[in-house]
């Protein structure tokens, strides 16, 4: 692949690998990608220090790099046609693995604007100076190179691989060798944290002199967010050494029996974990002191705890149990407030609906709006209500006063309106006369 010697640093939930080799940025990214990673991000000062550590490791292994000022690709690039934005920390560049822009940057010098070609970022290492945590590698921007022509002073690249979690390194209680094989195909005998899904091969013994016994373990998730090998007790234990070799592989105390056997133990305030090697702070939460949906939260160094309630609940006087908060006490609603377990809801009176400025506000329902009117004829909206009206010749009717009923003028309260015959019609009436009579011009009398 053109990428040679590599160094590894694993910390938190990520591993960084440094590789030497004169590759273009695209070739370097492809190399990282093939093993499930990307060219490294440097999103904070802490991450810059991790990257510097892995580069320092690489430089210790590399006999001689050709250039005094050496460059190593990281995953910061700007596509062709995308212009420089001096107002942003990343100046318009973005991380190849995606993710949001970050406030940290460490540019070597003021960037020149150029949108005509893709630009890539490398870390600039001055090999004449020791690598110090206070002097982090600067970011240098330039052409991305092409196969066979990586660009001036490009000496390698840094990859980053992210994991669900990490296992502690395996503890040896006697002579032996551990070899870790990571999911990104790196083998190492010394990792301060070992990534999830790594394999560990343990060969016990002192080479040819002893019978070698071997073990194989995988770093796996034993329970949610609990990563462990599943080995129990120190490995490669030997009566010849007892507790004298690497403290018997014990995390804290090692207790020897008379027969050369030994057991691991813990200092006061700590307990021995299932691996029979590691000690953890006695967890005051393990007795489940919190009740009613409260979550137990460990205090500093695992010495004490507090109970935390879900949103909408608060601790009661015992500070152990959760009780519902009556949010309605604070009158958060414009009209009606209904307290519910873990929350509340606002309701509006009849004639109002949720809306208007502010949380829990209510606005008048326009019952007379187009297509919504409950009235048969006229409708007038009022605050919180409405009223119906009828055209001439009709009166309001119905239980809810929304219907209009024709007035029978022929049987009106003032007696007959017509002198002779009266014909009621929808919304009106007309008069008529018996044969031989003619309706007068007033439309009422007969002549």
């Amino acid at each position: 692949t053109g990428a040679d010697t590599e160094a590894v640093v694993c910390v938190g939930t990520a591993c960084y690998t440094a590789h030497s080799g004169k590759l273009s940025a695209a070739e370097a990214q492809n190399h990282c990608n093939q093993n499930g990673g990307n060219l490294a991000t440097v999103k904070s000062k802490e991450e810059a220090q991790h990257v510097q550590r892995v580069l320092a490791q690489l430089l210790r292994r590399e006999a001689a790099l050709t250039a005094r000022m050496s460059k190593f690709w990281i995953g910061l690039q700007r596509e062709k046609g995308k212009c420089l934005d001096p107002s942003l920390p990343l100046k318009g560049f973005s991380w190849v693995g995606g993710g949001e822009d970050t406030p940290y940057s460490n540019w070597h010098k003021e960037l020149r604007n150029s949108c005509i070609s893709k630009r890539c970022v490398s870390l600039l290492l001055d090999l004449s100076q020791p690598l110090l945590p206070s002097r982090l590698p600067k970011w240098s921007e330039g052409p991305c190179g092409s196969p066979g022509s990586p660009g001036s002073n490009i000496e390698g690249f840094v990859c980053k691989f992210s994991f669900k979690g990490m296992c502690r390194p395996l503890a040896l209680g006697g002579p032996g060798q551990v070899t870790y094989t990571t999911p990104f195909q790196t083998t190492s005998s010394s990792l301060e944290a070992v990534p999830f899904a790594s394999a560990a091969n343990v060969a016990c013994g002192e080479g040819d002199k002893d019978e070698t016994q071997s073990h194989y373990f995988l770093c796996k998730e034993k329970a949610p967010d609990v990563f462990d090998w599943g080995s129990s007790g120190p490995l490669c234990v030997s009566p010849k050494y007892g507790c004298n070799f690497n403290n018997g592989g014990c995390h804290q105390d090692c207790f020897e029996g008379g027969d050369g056997s030994f057991l691991c133990g813990c200092r006061p305030g700590f307990r021995l974990l299932d691996d029979l090697v590691t000690c953890a702070s006695r967890n005051p939460c393990s007795s489940s002191p919190c009740r009613g949906g409260a979550t137990c939260v460990l205090g500093p160094h695992g010495k004490n705890y507090t109970c935390r309630c879900p949103q909408g609940y608060q601790l009661d006087s015992s500070q152990l149990d959760c009780v519902d908060v009556d949010e309605c006490q604070d009158s958060p609603c414009a009209q009606e407030c209904v307290n519910t377990p873990g929350g509340f809801r606002c309701e509006c009176w009849v004639g109002y609906e949720p809306g208007g400025p502010g949380e829990g506000a209510c606005q008048d329902v326009d019952e007379c709006a187009l297509g919504r009117s409950p009235c048969a004829q006229g409708c007038t909206n009022t605050d919180g209500s409405f009223h119906c009206s009828c055209e001439e010749g009709y009166v309001l009717a119905g239980e809810d006063g929304t219907q209009c009923q024709d007035v029978d003028e022929c049987v009106g309260p003032g007696g007959p309106l017509c002198d002779s015959l009266c014909f009621n019609t929808q919304g009106s009436f007309h008069c008529g006369c018996l044969p031989g009579w003619v309706l007068a011009p007033n439309g009422v009398s007969c002549t």
Epitope: K220, K222, A223, P224, G230, S288, T295, C296, V297
Partner: antibody, heavy 118, light 112 residues
């Protein structure tokens, strides 16, 4: 598709032992926990152990420790559950169940009825 | 061990009506990562259990959306919004936060 195929029903004498197999197919056998859950007639479910086929790591329910052994054969993608010192209380349907990445038990074998007779 | 209490032991609901099953745990199942490790399984006669809901409220593949899960750290509810004939089964809650994994005693759901 994911399949867990268990061995057939067994009738065994009290005090004896039984070995039930579970053959997995359709997924990366080495990368998922295989749990064992049992169900006595008309009763609920009880978890009693699991194995990680990748390296053979096991965890057991303390209630059964010393009586149950889980082993795996990666060449045939099979897990074996052996339960010793059987009593009538151990009469149950035994299920092998895959544990997924969400810690759910997503695929279940068809079950193996073990009847302990006196 | 984490102990769970499932209620009711049995439940009869009319077709099309809402069915609610509860489960209470002796310890919060809410992990510091924000995930609640509570699961619901359905078991029909003569069949192995089937995963319905994982991590308190997520519907397993192929499960109808009339099923839903909710709850807090220790109290959980499985709801079937409109009961269908094929929902007749025994329902179990379970926790996979801490070993040993434990199950509720089961709720038998029948049609009224």
């Amino acid at each position: 598709q994911v399949q867990l195929v268990q061995s057939g029903a067994e009738v065994v004498k009290s005090g004896a032992s039984v070995k039930v197999s579970c053959k997995a197919s359709g997924y990366a056998f080495s990368s998922y926990w295989l749990n064992w859950v049992r169900q006595a007639p008309g009763q609920g479910l009880e978890w009693f152990g699991r194995i990680y086929p990748g390296d053979g790591d096991t965890d057991y329910n303390g209630k059964f420790k010393g009586r149950v052994t889980l082993i795996r054969d990666t060449s045939t993608s099979t897990v074996y559950m052996e339960l010793t010192s059987l009593t009538s209380e151990d009469t149950a349907v035994y299920y092998c169940v895959r544990g997924d990445g969400y810690w759910a038990m997503d695929y279940w074998g068809q079950g193996t009825l073990v009847t302990v007779s006196s | 061990d984490i102990v769970m209490t499932q209620s009711p032991d049995s439940l009869a609901v009319s077709l099309g009506e809402r069915a609610t099953i509860n489960c209470r745990f002796s310890k919060s199942l809410l992990h510091s990562n924000g995930i609640t490790y509570l699961y619901w399984y359905q078991q029909k006669p003569g069949q192995p259990p089937k995963l319905l809901i994982y991590q308190m409220s997520n519907l397993a593949s192929g499960v109808p959306d009339r099923f839903s899960g909710s709850g807090s750290g220790t109290d959980f509810t499985l709801t079937i919004s409109s009961l269908q004939a094929e929902d007749v089964a025994v329902y179990y809650c379970a926790q996979n936060l801490e070993l040993p994994w434990t199950f509720g005693g089961g709720t038998k759901l029948e049609i009224k």
